[in-house]
């Protein structure tokens, strides 16, 4: 059962795995619900009861029955990982405490204008975990204004004490608001010869780099397939760093892989989520329970339904036996891996699917798309929304893309005579106007949040957010697309698509159904000499063919250019402006996503 | 109707600098660009450059880009071309023009020209 | 920068006869080439753009053809009132820029 709520002076007895030390009882809640085996959390705050050397300590809990004694205890906050609850989880943690100084490795100091500019400077250092900042108030003259960078094995404080006129806080990486380049690549025939922080048992070398990512102290990887010749190493993912932050050394080894970190695209593809099944394979682990299952799809259920289970491994029926139901085998580990992988028995294994709502809930796959033709199919473009006005009768005024469960993102310029936020209705997991009937349900828009630099489409910083007053429950017809990864601003999109309901040629009239239209992206300086009197910034991207033809058209303002990069759909662009519908050679114009993702998540995150 | 009037012909010393008006009626003047376009006696058709005037963006031809300066007045609906540091090539007439689109293309009313001789 | 370059510089041709225009790009230029018509001491005139299409007002015996970078204008029978300077422009790249013009002239 999911249990939000803070329990005060109360402290769970036992159970304990290990103690961090964290700045408070809701970060606790948070390493707890990322640690592998965390269900419960106790913390002692400051308080002139408690033992100084106490406080700020978080005692990382495990019970089999889910549950331990409570005992009161002043100054203790205990609670429940957020693991049995079926909501988004964020390890994203933008708060700053002041007075508190973290503990860690000081491996850069320098002088910072301001707390922000630290934590700033933090988030786009690749060793960076957390940081200490000194204020101009700080009584020692030569520490005033310094920013300490940190770091430790646990990506949390070694120890956390009370210290006047300093602030400290984290690396904002877990919120995708990292400069740091985000390299998707995975080498083969690759090993990369630095010191290993740790190592772990996985499956292929997609999990290998899934878990270098989550772990705190992993740059890059190195995995051995099970074809690599040395067979105590089979499936042995070799988690590593370095000084520099780069692999110093790349030796060439058939059957071997290596890769990088994805913290800095983690907003954009799934890190936690290890979906796939592995046949003829077996994952070894302390074994939790021994359920009948008819398939290894309900194996991964059960396992993903009991809040322990970390991976399984199920075996078929022999034949007319047990009502052809086979084995289920429900495990855990103590780092989440399996303890060893084994081939060639007729097993299939997999992981919980529990870690997945820890991604973002744009990252998770979507059916597949229908190849050709113009009209789109029902749940095709699961976070394409028609924006309606009813001022002065009703109409489909804009396309829009959701983004959160609260969030629409389009452009500025739908906005132009919108006196009022009551006069608009959202409609998602549409495919024809036609569906759109007196009682259909839409969420209605609570507030307008249109960029304060935007004069006109043409000028740029034509994006617009609406928040809706009601959230979005996600199905298969209506889900969010990722927003592009800073770090991913070098990546060349090939798969890129331009949706909406508009016109598909000048003075034509809406389209009733979703209409899609593939387009490739033009480069802004060939884009630039097709548009002489107006300029292209990087803060627009350029798509359409060179023969025209397919455009997007008036009435498709707003909407997504999605394109699709390593199997998740990002919103690269919104429809902005450009020259009539798919006029040969003029491409589309529209706003470049990436250049305003940190505008989206201070509009969208803020308190 | 649509109508471009340009000023009158000038003549102008080498080394100094002369500025062309061009007064737009008969459309809304910030929806379409503004290009400027000149005629050597006797050559043919050089591009100098381009106005945006709802946006006051200008992109200028590389012969020109050091020399020319292109600028508008919207209360009045006139664009203005302005080229510095004369010499006696740059005799031409010089014509305005508005794009037939709103983003670029054909040139579809053009101004009757000014005639700029550069003579010591 | 793209070059224009037409072809002939000069052409006579009798009254009701068809005059025809050479244009070739040094690239493609896809559609976005216009013809104009200039008459001695006035502005060039906008005949034809997008290659094909006639403007506004402009007699049905003058036509556009062509495709990537050979357009061609055609009088499909030649008036008094032809006599001009004809002149290609493409559109497709910045800077804009014009062939050298073809007179045309009554035989």
């Known amino acids: 059962e999911c249990v939000t709520q803070l329990l005060k002076d109360t402290c769970f007895e036992g159970g304990d795995i290990t103690t961090v030390f964290t700045p408070s009882a809701k970060y606790c809640q948070v390493v707890c619900t990322y640690h592998p085996r965390c269900l419960l959390f106790t913390f002692t705050a400051e308080s002139p009861s408690e033992d100084p050397t106490r406080w700020f300590t978080c005692v990382l809990k495990d019970s089999v029955t889910e549950t331990l004694p409570r005992v009161n205890r002043t100054a203790a906050i205990s609670g429940y990982s957020f693991k049995q609850c079926s909501h988004q989880i964020s390890a994203c943690n933008k708060d700053i405490y002041v007075d508190l100084d973290m503990k860690g490795i000081n491996y850069n100091s320098s002088v910072a204008k301001s707390a922000q500019e630290c934590q700033e400077r933090c988030t786009d250092d690749v060793h960076c975990h957390f940081f200490t900042y000194a204020t101009r108030q700080f009584p020692s003259l030569e520490h005033r204004n310094i920013c300490l960078l940190k770091h430790t094995q646990t990506g949390t404080p070694t120890r956390i004490t009370k210290l006047d006129k300093v602030v400290s806080g984290f690396s904002l990486k877990s919120c995708a608001l990292s400069n740091l380049a985000c390299i998707r690549d995975i080498f083969p025939n690759t090993v990369f010869a630095d010191s290993n922080i740790d190592s772990v048992m996985a499956p292929d070398a997609f999990v290998c780099g899934r878990i270098c990512t989550h772990h705190p102290g992993c740059l890059f990887f190195t995995f051995f397939s099970q074809e690599w010749p040395k067979e105590s190493q089979r499936n042995l993912c070799l988690l590593k760093t370095s000084e520099s932050g780069l692999p110093s050394t790349r030796i060439k080894k058939s059957k071997a892989l290596s890769g990088f970190s994805l913290q800095s695209c983690r907003h954009s593809i799934p890190v936690f989520c290890h979906s796939s099944f592995y046949h003829d394979t077996d994952f070894l682990g302390e074994e939790l329970d021994i359920v009948a299952a008819k398939s290894h799809e309900a194996c991964q259920k059960l396992c993903t339904n009991a809040v322990r289970c970390q991976f399984f491994t199920y075996t078929p029926a022999q034949a007319s036996c047990n009502e052809g139901k086979g084995k289920c085998y429900l495990k855990l580990s103590s780092n989440g891996s399996p303890t060893k992988i084994l081939h060639g028995r007729g097993g299939i294994s997999g992981y919980t699917l529990r870690l997945c709502k820890m991604d973002n809930e744009c990252t998770t796959k979507i059916k597949p798309r229908i190849v050709g033709g113009t009209a789109s199919v029902r749940g095709e473009w699961p976070w394409q929304v028609t924006l309606h006005t009813t001022s002065p009768t009703q109409r489909h005024l804009c396309g829009g893309s959701i983004i959160g469960n609260q969030w629409i993102l389009t452009a500025a310029h739908c906005f132009y005579g919108v006196e009022s936020p009551k006069i608009l209705r959202v409609y998602s997991g549409i495919l024809n106007q036609s569906e759109i009937k007196e009682d259909t349900s839409f969420f209605g828009v609570q507030e307008i949040i249109i960029h304060d630099q935007y004069k006109m489409a043409e000028s740029g910083y034509d994006i617009a957010l609406l928040k809706l007053e009601t959230t979005v429950n996600y199905t298969d017809s209506q889900r969010p697309i990722c927003l592009p990864s800073k770090g991913d601003r070098n990546v060349i999109y090939t798969d890129c698509w331009v949706t909406g309901w508009g016109y598909r040629k000048l003075r034509d009239k809406i389209q009733n159904t979703l209409q899609k239209a593939k387009i490739p992206l033009v480069t802004n300086e060939e884009c630039q000499k097709r548009y002489r009197g107006h300029k292209i910034t990087h803060k627009m991207i350029c798509a359409g063919y060179r023969e025209g033809g397919k455009d997007a058209c008036k009435g498709d303002s707003g909407g997504p250019l999605s394109c699709k990069h390593n199997e998740v759909w990002h919103l690269v662009g919104i429809t902005s402006w450009g020259e009539g519908c798919a006029q040969r050679e003029r491409p589309g114009v529209y706003t470049n996503v990436v250049e305003y993702v940190d505008w989206i998540l201070e509009k969208t995150q803020a308190v | 109707q649509v109508q471009l009037v340009q000023s009158g012909a000038e003549v102008k010393k080498p080394g100094a600098s002369v500025k062309v008006s061009c007064k737009a009626s008969g459309y809304t003047f910030t929806n379409y660009l503004i290009e400027w376009v000149r005629q050597a006696p006797g050559q043919g058709l050089e591009w100098m450059g381009v106005?945006?005037?709802?946006?006051?963006?200008?992109n200028y031809n590389e012969n020109f880009k050091d020399r020319v300066t292109m600028t508008r007045d919207t209360s009045i609906s006139t664009a203005y071309m302005e080229l510095s540091r004369l010499r006696s090539d740059d005799t031409a007439v010089y014509y305005c023009?508005?794009?037939?689109?709103?983003?670029?293309?054909?040139?579809?009313?053009w101004g009757q020209g000014t005639t700029v001789t550069v003579s010591s | 920068d793209i070059v224009m370059t037409q072809s002939p510089d000069s052409l006579a041709v009798s009254l009701g006869e068809r005059a025809t225009i050479n244009c070739k790009a040094s690239q493609s230029v896809s559609n976005d080439v216009a013809w104009y018509q200039q008459k001695p001491g006035q502005p060039p005139k906008l005949l034809i753009y997008?290659?094909?299409n006639r403007y506004t007002g402009v007699p049905d015996r003058f036509s556009g053809s062509g495709s990537g970078t050979d357009f061609t204008l055609t009088i499909s029978s030649l008036q008094a009132e032809d006599v001009a300077v004809y002149y290609c422009?493409?559109?497709?790249?910045?800077?804009?820029?014009f062939g050298g013009g073809t007179k045309l002239e009554i035989k």
């Open positions: 997008y290659i094909s």
């Open positions: 106005i945006n005037p709802g946006s006051g963006y200008t």
């Open positions: 023009a508005r794009t037939y689109g709103k983003y670029g293309g054909a040139m579809d009313f």
């Open positions: 422009q493409q559109d497709y790249s910045s800077p804009p820029t």
